[in-house]
Amino acid sequence: LNTTVLQGMAGQSLRVSCTYDALKHWGRRKAWCRQLGEEGPCQRVVSTHGVWLLAFLKKRNGSTVIADDTLAGTVTITLKNLQAGDAGLYQCQSLRGREAEVLQKVLVEVLEDPLDDQDAGDLWVPEESSSFEGAQVEHSTSRNQETSFPPTS
């Protein structure tokens, strides 16, 4: 798998969507992990609900939120209040027992906001590798705003 590069502004939210084959990954939980070094282990940040039928409910660890639309085959990760320390290499994973299959590798880059408190929503463009497999990004234009996905109320 090649790596998808996504850029977000410090202090804002970054939304990553990893698509997958819904039938192939039926019944499997998903996870978002941070890779420690190029060949190092991937440290779990957050995983979807322990009950697969409730995978669409948001699960949070700190400022990272995950939710999985298992019927559409899209797992969405939101990194809220992006900080410089959030930059790095991540993976979307599909969990099967103790094994984890990589759905997408994502390199998160954090940009300092040159306009400080002004809207910088149009100042960046996500870069996609040639083997782009569905990771997408949505960048909120107002600070700490997050797109609700999917509805839970």
């Epitope: 039926w26 019944g27 009950v51 039928l53 409730l54 669409f56 948001k58 019927l71 509805p151 839970t152």
Partner: antibody, heavy 126, light 106 residues
């Protein structure tokens, strides 16, 4: 009228099997996650397991204490959910309820259970 | 597993009183909490879902609030027909109920 009616309870010896039925009416059965709960005499409520809607291919989930012994299934043509209970233990003695999960849309629901049956008593004793 | 601690286990109040029941989760459960009413010999009835949403057809004297680990269920003016046991139920981990609160009339 939206309704759930359980049946099949009774007295059974330890180690034996029993199948409970939950007959639904008044709503589109296939569109809803169905769940089973139980309540031992004088005790609180305990979730047993649930079965997903048709969209989720009737995927099942169970509480740890019944996993491998109990099986939930559904028959959309009859609007019935079943709870097959094998290797019954005395601690399985309880009133068993079926309930419907609250739905937001075709794909999304919440495990708030908005319609319940009247319950059926299962007594496991020698 | 998440433990749900409901208190008090029982209470006695007069008609018209404001009644408050609390439910504490052993870890953060966001707003993934429901409240039910169960009358003797009857099935539970959903009153509040997602911590604060009133179920259709439920009287407005019932309300719920809270998020994270601490949740509150309130009956603003107790009525004779409210005599029942009330349960909270979380769904952040699996499906776990609190121990129940038995409400009686003085």
């Amino acid at each position: 009228e939206v309704q759930l009616v359980e049946s099949g309870g009774g007295l059974v010896q330890p180690g034996r099997s029993l199948r409970l039925s939950c007959t639904a009416s008044g709503f589109t059965f296939d569109d809803y996650t169905m769940s089973w709960f139980r309540q031992a005499p004088g005790k609180g409520l305990e979730w047993v397991g649930f079965i997903g809607s048709k969209a989720y291919s009737a995927t099942t989930e169970y509480t740890a204490s019944v996993k491998g012994r109990f099986t939930i299934s559904r028959d959309g043509s009859k609007s019935i959910a079943y709870l097959q209970m094998n290797s019954l233990k005395t601690e399985d003695t309880a009133v068993y309820y079926c309930a419907r999960g609250k739905r937001y849309s075709y794909t999304y629901w919440t495990p708030a259970f908005d319609v319940w049956g009247q319950g059926t008593m299962v007594t496991v004793s020698s | 597993d998440i433990q749900m601690t409901q208190s008090p286990s029982s209470l006695s109040a007069s008609v018209g009183d404001r009644v408050t029941i609390t439910c504490q989760a052993s870890q953060d459960i966001t707003n993934y909490l429901n409240w039910y009413q169960q009358k003797p010999g009857k099935a539970p009835k959903l009153l509040i879902y997602d911590a604060s949403n009133l179920e259709t057809g439920v009287p407005s004297r019932f309300s719920g609030s809270g998020s994270g680990t601490d949740f509150t269920f309130t009956i603003s003016s107790l009525q004779p027909e409210d005599i029942a046991t009330y349960y909270c139920q979380e769904y952040d981990s699996y499906i776990t109920f609190g121990g129940g609160t038995k409400v009686e009339i003085k």
